[in-house]
């Protein structure tokens, strides 16, 4: 498929654009804003004459140079100045500030906990399948298959540490070679970047906020994908990671050490352990080919057990497998030996919610997945609103300057490297790159952190998670020390190589440009963000895995033409941008292709049609949910009762504004329930602009 023109700045005059999103319409006076035609992002639309030659090419609002959506927004302070407040007002303001800070910490805590529960939910839903991916050893010797298995497993269990520990166990028990494990580690690195991309989806309410948040999250994805694109073939050809890590291990003598401190787990575990506790050894056992593990539940039932070691007669294949010649005998058919068998005696049950439910893993997983996503979404909305209310005026200026300003010349280049160190340090503290990058996503969305600054922080996070893995490897038992350390080092040097590829030279910071391009597309067509997520993290890896099952010839037969087509499109795209004159007239743009092949507009129409159809059919069922949501968000949504009517009729009806009764406005409902027609809700002194519906 040809590249989307949305990524091009093909317009000769950036001030002329279709249905202006910003710029010309900014002159509309306030009083007219209520009546002016608006697009679905709530911005007024100015109809502009369009040159026919650009009609099929420029399908996205190209903002004028003066108003770049990637510029960090000015967080205006509309409140009363400190000096203008009386004593009572000042005390109230202090208490408000403390209250907001406590609320922020509370929501942040819930946010991190919900990420933990989300990971558990994913493991319950797809953990066993993930384990089975690993148990297919023959496929994993193929590096491409290994890569996609790494992606799929990490996406399924939402934890790169789980997939890494499985790989370590498999290498330690010689089920997998280090060479075969390296592509899987690369895949796990990609898979772990899905979490913050999911978190970014929660910010789809406001187009510009979503643009920034999604780009900020996907910069991680692009870094990982691009690194793999270069480093996987390099590793397959030279085995440099394997050789380098071998050299490191031979040069330095590593002793068992302390594991990294679990600072965040100490805080979150008391809460998350009340919700669910998993026996992660089950996934590992499935991966190791234990057929019995397939029937075990991942849900931990017994938390306190006593292990009794008893001597048991067991059969062995031959006398060589006996514990010792003294403990070896035969019954004439089989050879027997004495083995110490550990029998578990259950003492006390775990204290989580699902301990006494005899629900299957899948059911518990789906329940937890739904609940954790709702909490994640809710927390994110609240964090964004709280931050939006706190980060105004001076505070915002200070924070933005601190985070986004470079060192003075000639040390400006050092700023990014300091950000990498900060990202690594913060990740090391919280022991999870997912938590760090997910927490950073809303900050990028609201404009506190720029994409340019988020990029090195994300790269640092990638390094931080590998240093954690190295420490964990050093704390592992003697029999797995070498393999776990080598894998952790492979992971570390892979990320270092990636940084060397895509960071030091500004020109090579391709992930930023690609993420911004994707951010632009997703801001206009928000469904594309979901499509991107499903396509790159599920469909593509599954397809490649399926083709790998069929064997190398099939994989090459299907893969090579696709790769050649992509390369052809990229070459053509570069020629169109750099030197279109050498191309025939027909190939200077993508108009020679059907519209659906070079624009998302037709696809958008189909999806809009499908969703409106879905709304019409399913709305009645959703009426109860709608009312509950309205009760939670505090506005009695008049549309809930009318949702079974035809949408055509509904569009004719006027929105009846209902005053919000003290809750935050709900992102998904805000268009329907605007506070006094202005779309603003003031709670704890916060003015939070209402957002449009998510999709």
């Amino acid at each position: 498929m040809a590249p989307w023109p949305e990524l091009e700045n093909a317009h000769p005059n950036p001030n002329k654009f279709i249905e202006g999103a910003s710029g010309p319409q900014s002159s509309i006076p306030d009083k007219d804003k209520g009546t002016s035609k608006t697009n679905d992002s709530g911005t007024p639309v100015a109809k502009i004459e369009l040159l026919p030659s650009y009609s099929a090419l420029v399908l996205i609002e190209e903002p004028p140079e003066g108003n770049d959506p990637w510029d960090l927004p000015e967080l205006q302070d509309n409140g009363i100045k400190w000096s203008e407040r009386d004593s009572k007002g000042k005390i109230l303001c202090i208490f408000q500030g403390i209250g907001k800070f406590i609320l922020l910490l509370g929501f942040l805590y819930l946010f991190v906990c919900s990420l933990d529960v989300l990971s558990s939910a994913f493991q319950l839903v797809g953990g066993k399948m993930a384990g089975q991916f690993f148990s297919n050893n023959s496929i994993m010797s193929n590096p491409v298959a290994g890569l996609v298995i790494g992606v799929l497993v990490t996406v399924m269990v939402q934890s790169s540490s789980t997939s890494s520990s499985i790989i370590v166990s498999m290498v330690a028990s010689s089920l997998l070679s280090v060479r075969a494990a390296i592509p899987i580690i690369m895949g796990a690195n990609i898979g772990t970047s899905i979490t913050n991309t999911i978190v970014a989806l929660m910010q789809a309410g406001d187009r510009n906020e979503f643009r920034r948040a999604f780009a900020g999250a996907t910069v991680h994805d692009f870094f990982n994908w691009l690194s793999v694109l270069v480093l996987l073939p390099l590793e397959a050809a030279t085995h440099y990671l394997e050789k380098l890590t071998n050299l490191v291990l031979e040069t330095f003598s590593f002793q068992n050490g302390e594991d990294a401190p679990d600072i965040l787990k100490v805080i979150t575990d008391p809460f998350t352990k009340l919700i669910i506790q998993l026996d992660k050894k089950v996934i590992q056992q499935i991966a190791m080919g234990d057929s019995e593990a397939q029937n075990k539940s991942l849900i931990k039932i017994w938390c306190k057990t006593i292990s009794n070691v008893i001597e048991e007669n067991v059969t062995v294949p031959s006398p060589d497998n006996c514990t010792s010649p003294s403990y070896c005998w035969t019954d004439g058919i089989q050879t027997w030996t004495i083995q110490n068998v550990t029998e578990k005696e259950n003492i006390a049950k775990c204290q989580h919610i699902f301990v006494n439910f005899s629900l299957p893993d899948l059911a518990v997983g789906i329940i937890l997945l739904t609940v954790s996503l709702l909490i994640l979404c809710g927390c994110l909305i609240m964090i964004v609103k709280l931050l939006g209310s706190v980060l105004r005026g001076q505070v915002a200026t200070v924070i933005k300057k601190t985070l986004n300003t470079d060192f003075p010349f000639p040390f400006a280049w050092l700023t990014g490297y300091l950000a990498i160190l900060v990202g690594a340090g913060m990740t090391f503290i919280v022991q999870s790159s997912s938590v760090f990058t997910s927490a950073m996503t809303p900050l990028i969305g609201i404009g506190v952190i720029s994409i340019e600054r988020a990029y090195p922080l994300t790269l640092g996070s990638n390094i931080g998670t590998t240093t954690t893995a190295i420490l964990a490897a050093l704390a592992s038992p003697g029999n797995t020390l070498r393999s776990s350390l080598q894998i952790a080092l492979c992971h570390f040097f892979f990320n270092i190589s990636g940084i060397l590829l895509w960071y030091p030279i500004p020109f090579t910071r391709l992930p930023i440009r690609l993420a911004k391009g994707l951010g632009n597309i997703s801001a206009k067509y928000r469904w594309f963000a979901v499509f991107y997520l499903i396509f790159f993290f599920l469909l593509t890896p599954l397809t490649v895995f399926g083709l790998s099952l069929a064997g190398w010839p099939v994989l090459v037969g299907v893969g090579v033409p696709i790769i050649l087509l992509i390369l052809l499109v990229l070459c053509l795209r570069m020629l169109q941008a750099r030197c279109p004159r050498i191309l025939p007239l027909k190939l200077r743009d993508w108009n020679f292709l059907p519209l659906w092949m070079h624009s998302l507009k037709p696809w958008d129409n189909i999806i809009s049609l499908a969703t409106s159809c879905f709304q019409r059919r399913c709305c009645c069922c959703c009426r109860v949910c709608c009312r509950v949501c309205c009760m939670v968000c505090g506005c009695k949504c008049c549309r809930c009762s009318k949702c079974c009517k035809n949408l055509e009729e509904e569009e004719k009806e006027q929105d009846v504004p209902v005053k919000a009764s003290g809750g935050f406005d709900n992102t998904a409902m805000s268009k329907e329930c605007q506070d006094e027609g202005k779309g603003q809700v003031e709670v704890l002194g916060m003015k939070a602009l209402s957002n449009t519906t998510v999709f």
Epitope: P325, S326, W329, T330, D331, G332, I333, T335, W336
Partner: antibody
Framework: QVQLVQSGAEVVKPGASVKMSCKTS????????MHWVRQAPGQGLEWIGA????????SYNQKFKGRVTLTADKSTSTAYMELSSLRSEDTAVYYC?????????????WGQGTLVTVSS | DIQMTQSPSSLSASVGDRVTITCKAS??????VAWYQQKPGKVPKLLIY???TRHTGVPSRFSGSGSGTDFTLTISSLQPEDVATYYC?????????FGGGTKVEIK
């Protein structure tokens, strides 16, 4: 009580084969390994092999491998031993025996024996 | 194969005497040794297994000891009915092997 009743004495020519039976009663046939031991006149005991009637798994003394076949018929609770390519030194009393001491090769019940005489 | 060497090949003792028969294995067999008694014209009878465990119905005057490669069968007080040939057997490895036998007679 456990009983192992073996077939009668056989006189066979060198190079021929002999198939003897061991009919069991008083226990569950498929539970215990059935061993075959021989004793040449005035000599010691020599283990030939064993069969687990439950699965049909067999184990043979390398000395007899290729010449001996152990089988078991679960329907009649009878074990069989066939010895081929007989030589004069195969003249012996052949015993079937079982070990009810689970997991050991110590045999505690014996058949009365089948005398096989190899003579031209 | 593991060789089991029994000694003596025959012995003569008086009623009431303490009789000791030894058996030496060519390699470590742990404690996987059994002792059998075979009276003239009869089938062998299991006396002891696991080196020292007496089989059901075996008189207490019979005892076994040893481990590894050296094993002993002891008849604490020889009785006229104990006249027989005694065999040791290892069941540590396949094939199971027997000793050459010790013939016990009464003086």
């Amino acid at each position: 009580q456990v009983q192992l009743v073996q077939s009668g004495a056989e006189v066979v020519k060198p190079g021929a084969s002999v198939k003897m039976s061991c009919k069991t009663s008083g226990y569950t046939f498929i539970t215990y390994n059935m061993h075959w031991v021989r004793q040449a006149p005035g000599q010691g005991l020599e283990w030939i092999g064993a069969i687990y009637p439950g699965s049909g798994d067999t184990s043979y003394n390398q000395k007899f491998k290729g010449r001996v076949t152990l089988t078991a018929d679960k329907s009649t609770s009878t074990a069989y031993m066939e010895l081929s390519s007989l030589r004069s030194e195969d003249t012996a009393v052949y015993y079937c025996s079982i070990s009810t001491i689970i997991t050991t090769g110590a045999v505690d019940y014996w058949g009365q024996g089948t005398l096989v005489t190899v003579s031209s | 194969d593991i060789q089991m060497t029994q000694s003596p090949s025959s012995l003569s003792a008086s009623v009431g005497d303490r009789v000791t028969i030894t058996c030496k294995a060519s390699q470590d067999v742990g404690t996987a040794v059994a002792w059998y008694q075979q009276k003239p014209g009869k089938v062998p009878k299991l006396l002891i297994y696991w080196t020292s465990t007496r089989h059901t119905g075996v008189p207490s005057r019979f005892s076994g000891s040893g481990s590894g490669t050296d094993f002993t069968l002891t008849i604490s007080s020889l009785q006229p009915e104990d006249v027989a040939t005694y065999y040791c057997q290892q069941y540590s490895r396949i094939p199971l092997t027997f000793g050459g036998g010790t013939k016990v007679e009464i003086k």
